[in-house]
């Protein structure tokens, strides 16, 4: 039991698979931790060993590769279940070793149940389609390597619980599902069921993903600053609270980082001495356009504060914009009370 480089439990790769379906799980060592692949390791005389810890147990035990019909097997760096059972849930470890070298990593595998409408605790990948953008396709995910290219599986597509047949703008095309023109009404969960034969048995692979229809890049514009604007003047007396909202609309842009910030006299609020607070809120439209509001607040504004430059800035992948707020000191109304009182004095 010499020292082994232990990468611990890799919770980033929380693997979920459906009960009673085939599952092929690659050892994460070669994908994420080591700089060489399985073939190199194997030809260098290293051996890959698998073991597991059952759910709610602490005891590591070897995986039984002598089950009927080879239900669990290993092929190169892949652990196969044909098919899975609910009690296969647990933490699996793959260890690569020889007499002088050892490296291992564990990962959680959860076998989940689904109902007849494919509802389950499975975390679903999200595929974004652009609204009214022309033909777009989604592909049945994670089915590579389950059957050879000579095998022609049957693929059935469902939206929610319903088999996709004679849908207006959604057409099944084998492993692909084509959306002729994506609309908000196409939002939902789509499932492909891949059925293939193997050694006289029939297996099913169920893959569900969420389709979200988002704003089209054709309609995307730079950020739009709704506030501050030309029509609102922030007129305050010293001692009052100054509140200026910076409200910015961002078109949906895939992988764009939307930023909003204030500058006061050309500096970030953190870099100046005045007591200013910024509160941010974010809302989204149905097509994931974003509105960000940052409210700049000075509790007790001074006459100096009312002569500063307050600029709202925004940036997205489409560009940077800015707008200065119109701030001014309120001129106090003249007070006539004393003069009037004198005027009404008794003679």
């Amino acid at each position: 039991s010499e020292r082994c480089d232990d990468w611990g439990l890799d919770t980033m790769r929380q693997i979920q698979v459906f009960e009673d379906e085939p599952a092929r799980i690659k050892c994460p060592l070669f994908e994420h931790f080591l700089k060489f692949n399985y073939s190199t390791a194997h030809s260098a005389g290293l051996t890959l060993i698998w073991y597991w810890t059952r759910q709610d147990r602490d005891l590591e035990e070897p995986i039984n590769f002598r089950l009927p019909e080879n239900r669990i097997s290993k092929e190169k760096d892949v652990l196969w279940f044909r098919p899975t059972l609910l009690n296969d849930t647990g933490n699996y470890t793959c260890m690569l070793r020889n007499t002088t070298y050892c490296s291992k990593v564990a990962f959680p595998l959860e076998v989940v149940q689904k109902d007849s409408c494919f509802n389950s605790p499975m975390k679903l990948p999200v595929h974004k389609l652009y609204i009214e953008y022309g033909i777009q396709r989604i592909t049945c995910p994670n089915v590579d390597g389950y059957f050879p290219s000579s095998v022609k599986p049957t693929i059935t597509w469902y939206m929610g619980c319903y088999k996709i047949q004679n849908f207006n703008n959604v057409i099944p095309e084998g492993m692909n599902l084509s959306f002729l023109i994506a609309l908000i009404s196409n939002n939902g969960n789509y499932t492909c069921v891949v059925t293939y034969p193997e050694n006289g048995r029939t297996f099913h692979l169920t893959r569900t993903l969420t389709v979200k229809v988002v704003g089209s890049p054709k309609n995307a514009v730079p950020p739009v600053i709704h506030s501050p604007n030309d029509h609102v003047v922030y007129e305050k007396e010293p001692g009052e609270e100054l509140l200026i909202p910076c409200t910015v609309y961002f078109s949906f842009l895939m992988d764009s980082r939307n930023e909003v910030w204030w500058t006061i006299d050309g500096k970030k609020p953190d870099d100046i001495t005045i007591d200013v607070t910024i509160n941010e809120s974010i809302s989204h439209s149905r097509t994931e356009d974003e509105t960000r509001t940052q409210i700049l607040s000075i509790k007790k504004v001074t006459s100096e504060d009312l002569k500063r430059s307050y600029v709202c800035h925004a940036r997205s992948a489409k560009g940077e914009v800015a707008k200065a707020a119109k701030v001014k000191q309120k001129v106090p109304a003249p007070r006539y009370t004393v003069e009037l009182a004198c005027g009404f004095g008794a003679t």
């Epitope: 514009v221 730079p222 950020p223 739009v224 030309d230 500058t263 006299d265 050309g266 500063r308 430059s309 307050y310 600029v311 489409k318 560009g319 940077e320 914009v321 800015a322 707008k323 200065a324 707020a325 119109k326 701030v327 001014k328």
Partner: antibody
Framework: QEQLVESGGGLVQPEGSLTLTCQAS?????????ICWVRQAPGKGLEWIAC???????TYYASWAKGRFTISKTSSTTVTLQMTSLTAADTATYFC??????????????WGPGTLVTVSS | DVVMTQTPASVEAAVGGTVTIKCQAS??????CAWYQQKLGQRPKLLIY???TLESGVPSRFEGSGYGTEFTLTISDLQSADAATYYC?????????????FGGGTEVVVK
């Protein structure tokens, strides 16, 4: 390196017309930019003429320039300024400049070297 | 339309000295003021925008201040390379009307 270069200047007769071109390099007008024309009469100050948003095509003109001057985006790297009914008062170096922001702000942080227009008979 | 009036028309100062240029707007323009430097025979260069924000690459010897109708550009520790004409500009992006007035310019002569 981002650059703007003006061309098309020269000698033109009074009441004549001229088209100036602003050529961009290092960036393209396929993205959202605001390109403006500013002029400077010999020994005088700067005078803003017009701007165009390259993404939305929106145009902005100084009140005195409306009607005689037309700003257009003619390709992904060129913006033009068409000038008509020219007089001696239009003699100036014409600069094209880019707005600092993606939508019009008037803050111009990239300038071309300018092209001289002389209106004379 | 807004008119920007710059004073003085010309100013002379020694290397290492300080120069102050003033710009007055004909109406309240809040913080919509920028400053440009133009050396003889060259294109203008943005120095400062929104009254006091320094454009990247501009030395901190250049400082903008003011608000509303009165704006100031201060150049401290004057260098011979600062000899140029300086323009203030009203920068405004109203959707209803656009009028970006420049001041008449101030020539800075470095002794």
């Amino acid at each position: 390196q981002e650059q703007l270069v003006e061309s098309g200047g020269g000698l033109v007769q009074p009441e004549g017309s001229l088209t100036l071109t602003c050529q961009a390099s290092g960036f393209t007008f396929s993205s959202y930019y605001v390109i403006c024309w500013v002029r400077q009469a010999p020994g005088k100050g700067l005078e803003w003429i017009a701007c165009i948003g390259t993404g939305d095509g929106l145009t902005y003109y100084a009140s005195w320039a409306k009607g005689r001057f037309t700003i257009s985006k003619t390709s992904s790297t060129t913006v033009t300024l068409q000038m008509t009914s020219l007089t001696a008062a239009d003699t100036a170096t014409y600069f094209c400049a880019r707005d600092r922001y993606a939508t019009v702000s008037g803050i111009l942080n990239l300038w071309g070297p300018g092209t001289l227009v002389t209106v004379s008979s | 339309d807004v008119v920007m009036t710059q004073t003085p028309a010309s100013v002379e100062a020694a290397v290492g000295g300080t120069v102050t240029i003033k710009c007055q707007a004909s109406q309240n323009i809040y913080s919509n003021c920028a400053w440009y430097q133009q050396k003889l025979g060259q294109r203008p260069k943005l120095l400062i925008y929104y009254v006091s924000t320094l454009e990247s690459g501009v030395p901190s010897r250049f400082e903008g201040s003011g608000y509303g109708t009165e704006f100031t550009l201060t150049i401290s520790d004057l260098q011979s390379a600062d000899a140029a004409t300086y323009y203030c500009q009203y920068t405004y992006d109203s959707s209803s009307s656009t009028s970006w007035a420049f001041g008449g310019g101030t020539e800075v002569v470095v002794k």
